[in-house]
């Protein structure tokens, strides 16, 4: 009778074990062990027992002790079970961002590990077990589906293997995968709201505002604002679940035409976009052209108004005939026209909107000088010793210089309060002079003495 000890062994992969082969007869013809494993016999006294060291045990094996005794041959097997923890325990890669309400499939792959009968795969969210299954196949795969909730944001999912050798008197060996941190998000189906001018004039600035509600987590939302190829740099203000992005937009002549204004909100691996067209236009103020801005009285003056080719103009409230970008009027310059404003108003339709521009020019009419009876009376009679102010107003453009002299030397103090004396009496020659010429007028001052009353 052949016996073996131990009859069952569990050992780590690559490990060694001592196996004793014994026989019940005292003088066996043969006593040995049959195994493909490297073996080393340990010398012992006696013939009916042999001890072997079996080394580098890589896989389950069944070495067989045999003996040949006078009453026949017999064998006994020992069962070597090799254990080892899995080589790789991994969660299949997933996008880190997942939309709330979506089903997320977690897949754990386990490579190797033995004995498989004692190996379990556990899928976890934090410390909470989601699924537990025996490891089957190579690689062993365990999957579970999770309905993504808002409160899963930041949760760590992992996969753990448990090689439970406690029933064999060993321990529980655990291997855990690298965690997968879930980032959940909500991006509403509604596109962002975009508020901007529909038309924008070249070399001006406009303000664009893009906003959206119902985002989670709002702080992770990226906002991209662009006008054509020009990226705008918005200032973003966040609410609880909303944001508002405000940007200034400057346009130049190169941007003229219809441009696409885009607001894109990116959250997780999704985006929402709103497109709007902005018409960039160039509309200089109309040009008011006077034949000459300064003319002499009686001169014929042409006033022209010219605007953008597509504009319609009115000159001093009178529409161009025919309606279009040009208008003109003719006049003979009179002193009353001096300082007269000629106003041209141009209207341009841009993307359904009417844009108005005005330009005003003033006409200067050169006339005079003039000395009229109304403004410079020819006769003054004042009582002696009374307080009087001699008034004589010369008219003209440019305003004439006025001097009133008696005998070529004695001035009449025009516009000044004086005490009337006998010396003031006499005839004065008032001379008004400007670049336009000069005029004279005689003014007589009579002084009434009290003795004549």
């Amino acid at each position: 009778q052949t016996s073996v000890s131990p009859s069952k062994v569990i050992l780590p992969r690559g490990g060694s074990v001592l196996v004793t082969c014994s026989t019940s007869c005292d003088q066996p013809k043969l006593l040995g062990i049959e195994t493909p494993l490297p073996k080393k016999e340990l010398l012992l006294p006696g013939n009916n027992r042999k001890v072997y060291e079996l080394s580098n045990v890589q896989e389950d094996s069944q070495p067989m002790c045999y003996s040949n005794c006078p009453d026949g041959q017999s064998t006994a097997k020992t069962f070597l079970t090799v254990y080892w923890t899995p080589e790789r325990v991994e969660l299949a890669p997933l996008p880190s961002w997942q939309p709330v309400g979506k089903n997320l499939t977690l897949r754990c792959q386990v490579e190797g590990g033995a004995p498989r009968a004692n190996l379990t795969v556990v899928l976890l969210r934090g410390e909470k077990e989601l699924k537990r299954e025996p490891a089957v196949g190579e690689p062993a795969e365990v999957t579970t589906t999770v309905l993504v909730r808002r409160d899963h944001h930041g949760a760590n999912f992992s996969c753990r293997t448990e090689l439970d050798l406690r029933p064999q008197g060993l321990e529980l060996f655990e291997n855990t995968s690298a965690p997968y941190q879930l980032q959940t998000f909500v991006l509403p189906a509604t596109p962002p709201q975009l508020v901007s001018p529909r038309v924008l004039e070249v070399d001006t600035q406009g303000t664009v505002v893009c906003s959206l509600d119902g985002l989670f987590p709002v702080s992770e939302a990226q906002v991209h604002l662009a006008l054509g190829d020009q990226r705008l740099n918005p200032t973003v203000t966040y609410g609880n679940d909303s944001f508002s992005a405000k940007a200034s937009v400057s346009v130049t002549a190169e941007d003229e035409g219809t441009q696409r204004l885009t607001c894109a909100v990116i959250l997780g691996n999704q985006s929402q976009e709103t497109l709007q067209t902005v018409t960039i236009y160039s509309f200089p103020a109309p040009n008011v052209i006077l034949t000459k801005p300064e003319v002499s009285e009686g001169t014929e003056v042409t006033v022209k108004c010219e605007a953008h080719p597509r504009a319609k103009v009115t000159l001093n409230g009178v529409p161009a005939q025919p309606l279009g970008p040009r208008a003109q009027l003719l006049l003979k310059a009179t002193p009353e026209d001096n300082g007269r404003s000629f106003s041209c108003s141009a209207t341009l339709e841009v993307a359904g909107q009417l844009i108005h521009k005005n330009q005003t020019r003033e006409l200067r009419v050169l006339y005079g000088p003039r000395l009229d009876e109304r403004d410079c009376p020819g006769n003054w009679t004042w009582p002696e010793n009374s307080q009087q102010t001699p008034m004589c107003q010369a008219w003209g453009n440019p305003l004439p210089e006025l001097k009133c002299l008696k005998d070529g030397t004695f001035p009449l103090p025009i516009g000044e309060s004086v005490t009337v004396t006998r010396d003031l009496e006499g005839t004065y020659l008032c001379r008004a002079r400007s670049t336009q010429g000069e005029v004279t007028r005689k003014v007589t001052v009579n002084v009434l003495s009290p003795r004549y009353e």
Epitope: E87, R88, E138, E141, A178
Partner: antibody, heavy 120, light 112 residues
Framework: QVQLVQSGAEVKKPGASVKISCKAS????????LHWVRQAPGQRLEWMGV????????DYNQKFRGRVTITVDKSATTAYMELSSLRSEDTAVYYC?????????????WGQGTALTVSS | DVVLTQTPLSSPVTLGQPASISCRSS???????????LHWYLQRAGQPPRLLIY???NRFSGVPDRFSGSGAGTDFTLKISRVEAEDVGVYFC?????????FGGGTKLEIK
């Protein structure tokens, strides 16, 4: 004892396809994956792909993607490697090898090899 | 792809003497779990490769203890303490850390 026995040598014309089999025995078939490796004359060994004998999942070397297909018949404990659009550079000895799916413990048992000659 | 460079290409050795083969990787072979999946194979003439060492230093079943592996990161060595006649053949290193898996060019061991 573990054995991987491959189908016999093949001679093919350029543009044709070849399908090589690998019959496994001596172990629990679905406990190990099967890999395919080739050795062209004067070239280093080249890993082609792997199949999970349990699930049928595969992974291929990008170099062969689109030309190589690895399949498994669990009931026959046999894996197959088909290579299409053959060219002269595909002349090589093709091996199947047993391992873990990601090969972490090395390819512990190999088939005897199948010689493929591609010639017009 | 990861390139494994073996040196020497050929190594003539006297029976009973030690032999050493080097394998250098173009990038680290340490996987994210801390393990290094570098293996050694021997291919005798007309035969398929045979696994000698797995994971840098673990001898496979039935491999004599005169074979040992060492190294870390990118530099690895296979040593034979006393060369025997049956050790003649081409030795390959191989990596299963990075996809696709690759092999070294081989080192031919021959007896002087």
């Amino acid at each position: 004892q573990v054995q991987l026995v491959q189908s016999g040598a093949e001679v093919k014309k350029p543009g044709a396809s070849v399908k090589i089999s690998c019959k496994a025995s001596g172990y629990t078939f679905t406990d190990y994956a099967l890999h395919w490796v080739r050795q062209a004359p004067g070239q280093r060994l080249e890993w082609m792909g792997v199949i999970s004998t349990y699930s049928g999942n595969t992974d291929y070397n990008q170099k062969f993607r689109g030309r190589v297909t690895i399949t498994v018949d669990k009931s026959a404990t046999t894996a197959y490697m088909e290579l299409s659009s053959l060219r002269s550079e595909d002349t090589a000895v093709y091996y199947c090898a047993r391992s873990l799916y990601f090969g972490s413990s090395g390819f512990d048992y190999w088939g005897q090899g199948t010689a493929l000659t591609v010639s017009s | 792809d990861v390139v494994l460079t073996q040196t020497p290409l050929s190594s003539p050795v006297t029976l009973g003497q030690p032999a050493s083969i080097s394998c250098r990787s173009s990038q680290t072979l340490v996987y994210r779990n801390g393990n290094t999946y570098l293996h050694w194979y021997l291919q005798r003439a007309g035969q398929p490769p045979r696994l000698l060492i797995y994971k840098v230093s673990n001898r496979f079943s039935g491999v004599p203890d005169r074979f040992s592996g060492s190294g870390a990161g990118t530099d690895f060595t296979l040593k034979i303490s006393r060369v025997e006649a049956e050790d003649v053949g081409v030795y390959f290193c191989s990596q299963n850390t990075h996809f696709p898996y690759t092999f070294g060019g081989g080192t031919k061991l021959e007896i002087k």
